[in-house]
């Protein structure tokens, strides 16, 4: 996860009611019994602020020691912090639990602003309106951090829910979905919706509001309208998908899909924008401008670096163009379309206390290590991380926001011939392929 | 040609709030863009505030939240209301109109300008 335009976490209001939902089609392929249908005491167990990330309650513990943990799709340890900070209300603490185990050993985890280290365990651990299971999961806990923690954010540690593969210090520290699955019944899948508000809130506002829901198991049909559709996992580290096609506003960006996905393309909700490689994002731009240059903006919106502000209520959303991803399918040759709208990528600016304005800053930015597919994308969408099968089901999603003229959408199938070729190869740079 | 006079401009208590207006007059060349820019005691001339064509909006971002900026319907007069004022605030504040540009809070960007309105904040 890249740590530093982390993701946005708003309230649920704003989008299609729930249970309000399209037939459904028949043509899906059933799924393993208990995985679907209803989970209805996890539904909501999200919340969270625009830009900050979005949180669950777990505990940590005996007696239990109840914390607020972001949900980053995009790192691979649990980590809370476990000594005072000045933006932590609480923290871990260790020799108040019965059932720590010290491993005796360090972790160190540097970002690219920032860092974080502490010192690796295990406790008991819960999650109170997920499964009802308790099991014994690795803990990182943080000692000191820099540029990590979030003041007002609300959230005190952090869920790494990818693959052993990129957990610190290295892939023999399982991760907490591997030990959840390895320890219960609990199915080897988790479902993510994330509601963004489509305007800001004030700290009360968040506190009282929904952020969306983690369905740990399952797949909760209430969250979604239409059909799911799967792109396979390319590789288990990150959540890895390739990205086959981008179009702005039924535009195809016409560039070689590899750079799409150079040097790779991740799902990850702990990142708040949308972000792209450097070749990809100057192009979307350029289209972008062009499609809304009804308007101006200043240079600096398009770097994320100015807010665009309109009279309340005026915001001309239908000046600026839908965005689509075409992601490679499960079948050969065949693709599905994931679109969304400028209120997903248009990101309401909380500090903006005037009523008399709604302010945005641009939510896609640039990356110099691959696609990031951050909470811009996953606000639009159901996000089903079937682990067990390999692959990343999207369905449009029941809190997305939109206006009476557009929706996000998620549609297929689509012919696209040689997908395999849009993946980029990371060259290997252990010392096993240096040949001398 | 064009002229601009702003208006609004006093004394103030640490928290208080003030409205400033600025009236164009003259020339009937549209200009699209409009801002106002500060200049406090012993430091630069910077972007408060910007406006093009009386909808889209941006702000300094340090001043973000407090103030908003805004046109009348015929965009002959310009305002900034300012909330939550600190002593920090205290500057000439100027008004400023021209054809723009991709930095809409570069002085540079603006063609014509008032002669400004003071704003003292008082602690």
């Known amino acids: 996860t890249q740590h530093g335009i982390r993701l946005p976490l708003r309230s649920g209001l704003g989008g299609a009611p729930l249970g309000l939902r399209l037939p459904r089609e028949t043509d899906e392929e059933p799924e393993e019994p208990g995985r679907r249908g209803s989970f209805v005491e996890m539904v909501d167990n999200l919340r969270g602020k625009s830009g900050q990330g979005y949180y669950v309650e777990m505990t940590v513990g005996s007696p239990p020691q109840t914390l607020n943990i972001l949900v980053d799709t995009g790192s691979s340890n649990f980590a809370v912090g476990a000594a005072p900070h000045p933006f932590l209300h609480r923290y871990y603490q260790r020799q108040l639990s019965s059932t720590y185990r010290d491993l005796r050993k360090g972790v160190y985890v540097p970002y690219t602003q920032g860092k974080w280290e502490g010192e690796l365990g295990t406790d008991l651990v819960s999650i109170p309106h997920g499964p009802n299971v308790t099991v014994r999961a690795n803990i990182a806990a943080i000692t000191e951090s820099d540029k990590f923690f979030i003041n007002g954010s609300n959230w005190e540690g952090i869920l790494g829910l990818a693959y052993a593969e990129i957990a610190r210090p290295d892939d023999s520290l399982e991760p907490f979905f591997d030990s959840l699955v390895k320890q219960t019944h609990v199915p080897n899948l988790f479902s993510l919706q994330l509601c963004g508000a489509g305007f800001p809130l004030n700290q009360s506002e968040v506190l009282a509001s929904v952020g969306g829901s983690m369905i740990i198991g399952g797949i909760d049909h209430s969250l979604y309208t239409g059909s799911l559709w799967y792109t396979p996992i390319r590789r288990e580290w990150y959540y890895e998908v390739i990205i086959v096609r981008v179009e702005i506003n039924g535009q195809d960006l016409k560039m070689d899909c590899k750079e799409y996905n150079y040097d790779k393309s991740i799902v990850d909700s702990g990142t708040t924008n949308l972000r792209l490689p450097k070749k990809v994002f100057e192009a979307a731009v350029k289209s972008i401008k062009a499609a809304s240059s009804t308007e101006k903006f200043p240079d600096g919106f398009w770097l994320g670096e100015q807010l665009v502000c309109w009279q309340a209520g005026t915001t001309p959303w239908n000046i600026f163009p839908v965005i689509s991803l075409y992601l490679m399918g499960e079948v050969t040759n065949q693709s599905f379309r994931i679109t969304i709208l400028p209120q997903q990528y248009l990101r309401p600016v909380e500090d903006v206390a005037t009523s008399q304005d709604d302010c945005y800053k641009f939510a896609i930015s640039q990356s110099s290590t691959g696609t990031v597919m951050g909470a811009v994308i996953m606000e639009g969408f159901y996000v089903v991380f079937d682990r067990a099968r390999k692959r990343i089901g999207f369905a449009v999603s029941a809190c997305h926001v939109h206006d009476e003229f557009r929706t996000a959408a998620v549609e297929g199938p689509f012919v696209t011939l040689d997908m395999e070729d849009c993946g980029y190869n990371i060259p290997q740079t252990d010392e096993s392929t240096l040949m001398t | 040609d064009v002229q601009l006079q702003e208006s609004g401009g006093g004394s103030v208590q640490a928290g208080g709030s003030l409205r400033l207006s600025c009236a164009r007059s003259g020339g009937t060349v549209s200009i699209p863009y409009m801002a106002w820019f500060r200049q406090g005691p012993g430091k630069e001339r910077e972007g408060v505030a910007a406006i093009y064509d009386g909808r889209a909006k941006t702000y300094a971002g340090s001043l973000q939240g407090r103030f908003t900026i805004s046109q009348d319907n015929d965009k002959n007069t310009l305002y900034l209301q300012m909330n939550s004022l600190k002593p920090d605030d205290t500057a000439v504040y100027y008004c400023?109109?021209?054809?723009?540009?991709?930095?809409?809070?570069?002085?540079?960007?603006?063609?014509?300008w008032g002669k400004g309105t003071q704003v003292t904040v008082s602690s």
């Open positions: 400023a109109a021209g054809n723009g540009g991709g930095n809409w809070l570069r002085p540079s960007e603006y063609n014509y």
